[in-house]
Interface confidence: low
């Protein structure tokens, strides 16, 4: 439904507080290097303008699209050319090309300083002195570092962030109260950002059909009692929401997400019995809760799939009449019966079914041709099952840190051209699948593990896309969204790789390592491990283990020494020499 003024419409729907927060997020996700104060100024100007449009929708410029209004505002930034270089050329374009241009310049790995957490008292003072600025700063810092963060969900994080400070800054032990909450928000935030990044990559790189297929599978698992038409309606609406957010249309996205939550709650009876608690919560909590809600119980009397999709004489007729609808029905029926499968596995099965029908419906005897299609599913199901079983056994044997190290070695040997920080980040995250998923019973392991791995491998893909260095990574990332994980799993050692020149500087450590947190110390050691593999890709597990054990002992010894720096200098030289000898460098 058309509104005379889109900006007035969204301001009224969302309210001033959410409007301002979402415009700040949008601007920070586009202009990631701009100072906080500059963004606040731009947001205030847009907000004042929106208020004039609410008062009179016919006022000058109120009929302009949000992209036009926001783009014009971003293009007033004086330092655009020197700060962003060629991104400034976007401003010479007209909408919609200008917005597309801004989107293409979003940086998944912006060159921004690491966020350092101040002392608790310092944070509490800042919170009490100016709560509004404090919370805006949180939105700004997260949004600029995560340019695809799901904006309405970031509002939910900000609400929890505020609640944590409100409660803990008046607690007897502020730090004990606040720090675990901030750690939890940080970890959940990173996970949320990565999950949304996959949704946006799915839409942007593989198209709406790929996203809708993912959504059909996931919602059918979650709402197995809902009929296909209901699931399809939810998929259509959810696709619109994510298309908007991934496209930078954050006001429309937040508004439509609220409408979708409202619809789901008004129609719980025909969707899921698990929504009752979610639907009693306020809006932001409600939307988050619905997105995370557990799978409903499967209906008890579901008939065999074979009747409609293999045995029926109408299979090819139904497929020809509306291919995507028929495949959608297949995916819905298969997914609602299999909450124990990963979404990507379900999509692989649907693709196999589609390929079979394409071939068989053109054959002399179609039924004879597709009669055994379900037999083709067996190896597809067993491959992730076996992989998860093996890796969970390895995880249980090694523990998280050493499991991460095993993956670091594995992936560095597969794609040694990838930058060391990226290999460390991605392998550490891959390794977290152990503690995240291996504790689950068999029925929940695969959806947990393989869908999580899809999210992590997407991080590798988006980071690699910025500076492509490996044809193998490009191939696995671009050929098939659902086969990314099997593609990476199938990669063997890259025999074409020319080992990196040995550089002693890479293995020179200083006393500052002693003051690092356990996590940061692990990252230092894992960085060294990647570099070792890049120097000696053919090194055996035993050789690498020996060097890493020596390294751990060296760090422990020097951190206990009186003169730490001298110890690191002298013992470090010995360690490098010993390592070179051990690895035959």
């Amino acid at each position: 439904d058309a509104h005379k003024s889109e900006v007035a419409h969204r301001f009224k729907d969302l309210g001033e507080e959410n409007f301002k927060a979402l415009v700040l997020i949008a601007f920070a996700q586009y202009l990631q290097q701009c100072p906080f104060e500059d963004h606040v100024k731009l947001v205030n100007e847009v907000t004042e303008f929106a208020k004039t449009c609410v008062a009179d929708e016919s006022a000058e410029n109120c009929d302009k699209s949000l992209h036009t209004l926001f783009g014009d505002k971003l293009c007033t930034v004086a330092t655009l050319r020197e700060t962003y270089g060629e991104m400034a050329d976007c401003c010479a374009k007209q909408e919609p090309e200008r917005n597309e241009c801004f989107l293409q310049h979003k940086d998944d790995n912006p060159n921004l300083p690491r966020l350092v957490r101040p002392e608790v008292d310092v944070m509490c003072t800042a919170f009490h002195d100016n709560e509004e600025t404090f919370l805006k700063k949180y939105l700004y810092e997260i949004a600029r570092r995560h340019p695809y963060f799901y904006a309405p969900e970031l509002l939910f994080f900000a609400k929890r962030y505020k609640a944590a400070f409100t409660e803990c800054c008046q607690a007897a032990d502020k730090a004990a109260c606040l720090l675990p909450k901030l750690d939890e928000l940080r970890d959940e935030g990173k996970a949320s950002s990565a999950k949304q990044r996959l949704k946006c990559a799915s839409l942007q790189k593989f198209g709406e059909r790929a996203f809708k297929a993912w959504a059909v599978a996931r919602l059918s698992q979650r709402f197995p009692k809902a009929e296909f038409a209901e699931v399809s309606k939810l998929v259509t609406d959810l696709t619109k929401v994510h298309t908007e957010c991934c496209h930078g249309d954050l006001l429309e996205c937040a508004d439509d997400r609220a409408d979708l939550a409202k619809y789901i709650c008004e129609n719980q009876d025909s969707i899921s019995s698990k929504l009752k608690e979610c639907c009693e919560k306020p809006l932001l909590e409600k939307s988050h809760c619905i997105a995370e809600v557990e799978n409903d119980e499967m209906p008890a009397d579901l008939p065999s799939l074979a009747a409609d999709f293999v045995e029926s004489k109408d299979v090819c007729k139904n497929y020809a009449e509306a291919k995507d609808v028929f495949l959608g029905m297949f995916l819905y029926e298969y997914a609602r019966r299999h909450p124990d499968y990963s979404v990507v596995l379900l999509l692989r099965l649907a693709k196999t079914y589609e390929t079979t029908l394409e071939k068989c419906c053109a054959a002399a005897d179609p039924h004879e041709c597709y009669a055994k299609v379900f037999d083709e599913f067996k190896p597809l199901v067993e491959e992730p099952q076996n992989l998860i079983k093996q890796n969970c056994e390895l995880f249980e044997q090694l523990g998280e840190y050493k499991f991460q190290n095993a993956l670091l070695v594995r992936y560095t040997k597969k794609v040694p051209q990838v930058s060391t920080p990226t290999l460390v980040e991605v392998s550490r995250n891959l390794g977290k699948v152990g503690s995240k998923c291996c504790k689950h019973p068999e029925a929940k392991r695969m959806p947990c593990a393989e869908d999580y791995l899809s999210v992590v491998l997407n991080q590798l893909c988006v980071l690699h896309e910025k500076t492509p260095v490996s044809d193998r990574v490009t191939k696995c990332c671009t050929e098939s969204l659902v086969n990314r994980r099997p593609c990476f799993s199938a990669l063997e050692v890259d025999e074409t790789y020319v080992p990196k020149e040995f550089n002693a500087e890479t293995f020179t450590f200083h006393a500052d390592i002693c003051t690092l947190s356990e996590k940061e110390r692990q990252i230092k050691k894992q960085t060294a491990l990647v570099e070792l593999v890049k120097h000696k890709p053919k090194a055996t597990k035993e050789q690498l283990k020996a060097v890493m054990d020596d390294f751990a002992a060296f760090v422990e010894k020097c951190c206990k020494a009186d003169d730490k720096e001298t110890c690191f200098a002298e013992e470090g030289k010995k360690l490098v020499a010993a390592s070179q000898a051990a690895l035959g460098l």
Partner: nanobody
Amino acid sequence: EVQLLESGGGLVQPGGSLRLSCAASGRYIDETAVAWFRQAPGKGREFVAGIGGGVDITYYADSVKGRFTISRDNSKNTLYLQMNSLRPEDTAVYYCAARPGRPLITSKVASLYPYWGQGTLVTVSS
């Protein structure tokens, strides 16, 4: 915005036939999932038949399968319900409902349809 106007209802003897029409304006009917529902006196709205948007995949309630046929004429922007072998229990007000956005499937759930006609009365009696 979609406006729907039903016609064709009336009194018919058991075993007889009727053809209901639903003229749509404001939206092309082939871009819309459309359905017929009925409401007997003192009862809730019940799904009768539906047809998807963009493709002619049809759906029927078990009670009318083999007797009723849903179709549409895109050139006239009109939906039809051909009702044969009518029974007294088919007596009801028949409503046409639309769900735009090109959903390829229809639904048996009345709340999914935002647009409704005013209804046409069908009475089956001897």
